[in-house]
Structure formats: C-alpha cells, structure tokens
C-alpha cells in the first residue's frame, strides 16, 4: 500500500507546506507514515514534513516528546500519522453558531 504525505525537507517559515506542490508518494512497503516537525523560533513557526517508516517516526516522536511545549520559544514537536496527507493543515475549528 502506498501513502501520500506532504514533504518539505528544509524548514519553511510560517508556511506549513500543505499545498499540492508539496505532496509526494512515499516508498511502497517502507514508508508507511507521515511525519511533521514543528519548531517555534523568534522569527515564527518553522515546519518540516516528510514520509517515514513507522519505526523511524515513532523513535523520534517518543524520544523527543519532552521537547514539545507549544507556544514556547524553541519548542520542537514531532508528530506521526498513518493516513493519506495526515501531516497537512490542522482542521479548522468550526465556529459555534
């Protein structure tokens, strides 16, 4: 089974690289997850994304969980997911009506 992910190997400033030009086909039977690294810097929020094997992504996300402090300078958050394009933009919250 082949999964698609958003991929930007180098950090993108305030651009979560979730547009169609960043979509890639992951390596069949090897890369079964999408991963995302979000780093908070003084200049803004930096994003890196790629395909990954489940082991690679889980090693990184588990080993570096303590580095994730959203809203804090130099916070680094790693996330892994296994559905197509799941490392894209967060779903917009619906406004209450």
């Amino acid at each position: 089974l082949q999964i698609q992910c958003y991929q930007c190997e180098e950090f993108q400033l305030n651009n979560d690289c979730s547009s169609p030009e960043f979509i890639v086909n992951c390596t069949v039977n090897v890369q079964d997850m999408c991963q995302k690294e979000v780093m908070e810097q003084s200049a803004g929020i930096m994003y890196r994304k790629s395909c990954a094997s489940s082991a690679a992504c889980l090693i990184a996300s588990a080993g570096y969980q303590s580095f994730c402090s959203p809203g804090k300078l130099n916070s680094v958050c790693i996330s892994c997911c296994n559905t197509p394009l799941c490392n894209g933009p967060r779903p917009k919250k619906r406004g209450s009506s």
């Epitope: 991963q35 003084s42 690679a56």
Partner: antibody
C-alpha cells in the same frame, strides 16, 4: 550493540574512483539518516552529505556535488559513498554516522573511519 | 549555507580548570546544535545535542547552552581525559556544517 564499520579506503590516483561502504549493525538504517563526514590530515571535520535510506533522498556539500554519490542497500543494511573524479584535496579519513531525521538530534554513532589518499 | 564560527581555535588549561568554548551561527538555528569531542586517530563522540542536552553516558561536567545564534560548551572541571578537540555542528538545514574546532591542550 550499534555499530558502523567503514571500508573501501585506500590509495587512488587523481581522477580515479573509489567506493566506500558503511555497514551497520544493531539498528536498521531505514530508521535513520546516514551521513558521511570527512577529515583531511590535521584539519577539522567537513560534512560531505547524507542519505535517508528509506526514500533514497540525498544531499551533498558543494565541494563534492556532481562527483560523489551516496546510496544504500537496505537489504544489506549498508550505505555507500561512490567517489569519482577524485582530487588531492579529497584526501581524508571518511566517517559515516547515523542521525535521526529530527533537526535537534545529534550524530550519536560513528564508524571508525577509513583513509582515502589521492596521490600520483 | 549556515556558517559556524568557533572560538578559540586552541586553548591551554590545567586539570580542574573551567573551560568555555563558543560557537556562533551565521543565522538563527534555534537549538539545532550538537557538540562533539574528538581524540587523535579516533572518531568524534557526541557530547551535547539540542544545544543543551547531555548525551547518554557523557559526564555531567560537560554542559551546553544557547539558542538562536550563540552557543557555549562548558567543561566545569577539566579532567586529564578531556584534552581533545571539540567541534560544534548545526543540523538546522543542509549542509550541516561544523565549526573549525577547538583544541584543548595541557598547560
């Protein structure tokens, strides 16, 4: 036990080619980036390039771009550095090292290095 | 490319001394900096990752600090086995350049 073992170094004439191997054991290379770093005699460390074996994605330092190629054979758990059009300034000890994809990780395991001498 | 400027290039110190080595990045690299120790004829060894986190098995006399562009490696009380060359490296964006190295010699 995690180990990286380089081999393939030796004496080669300018313009010649050499292929270095980096055999990994104790971990699976598809879970890491494999980086090549070199050190000329009496000089500092120079980052040469890296491969993500799970995708084959590579990146090279400008000094070797177009002449060196990094590849990996995941079935052998081994990475390679193919060096073509070698120059005297490529003379160095070549190390391979592993690093997680995450930016803040360090290169936690290194091979012992293999010496490449480019001379006529 | 991001440059890493390390200083001093060499220093002489005695056992028990406090030693400080600095590294400056040419642009903001957040905390994506590691420090390595290398002894003659040996491969480098990871000491510090993410600018300030001590790698497993490294003695607590080693510490790192900094973020953005300015980073420091400190050895609180130099031991005989610490005489070596130290390198900083960023891994913020390829190429992952190293500093020029600092050789710590016996006074």
């Amino acid at each position: 036990e995690v180990q990286l073992v380089e081999s393939g170094g030796g004496l080669v004439q300018p313009g010649g080619s050499l292929r270095l191997s980096c055999a990994a054991s104790g971990f699976t290379i598809t879970n890491y980036g494999i980086h090549w770093v070199r050190q000329a005699p009496g000089k500092g460390l120079e980052w040469v390039g890296r491969i993500y074996p799970d995708s084959g994605a590579t990146y090279y330092a400008d000094s070797v771009k177009g002449r060196f190629t990094i590849s990996a054979d995941t079935s052998k758990n081994t990475a390679y550095l193919q060096m073509n059009s070698l120059r005297a300034e490529d003379t160095a000890v070549y190390y391979c090292a592993r690093k997680l994809w995450i930016s803040i990780a360090g290169m936690d395991y290194w091979g012992q290095g293999t010496l490449v001498t480019v001379s006529s | 490319d991001i440059q890493m400027t390390q200083s001093p290039s060499s220093l002489s110190a005695s056992v028990g001394d406090r030693v400080t080595i600095t590294c400056r990045a040419s642009q903001d690299v957040s905390t994506a900096v590691a420090w390595y120790q290398q002894k003659p004829g040996k491969a480098p060894k990871l000491l510090i990752y993410s600018a300030s986190f001590l790698y497993s098995g490294v003695p607590s006399r080693f510490s790192g600090s900094g973020s953005g562009t300015d980073f420091t490696l400190t050895i609180s009380s130099l031991q005989p086995e610490d005489f070596a060359t130290y390198y900083c490296q960023h891994s913020y964006a390829t190429p992952f350049t190293f500093g020029q190295g600092t050789k710590v010699e016996i006074k």
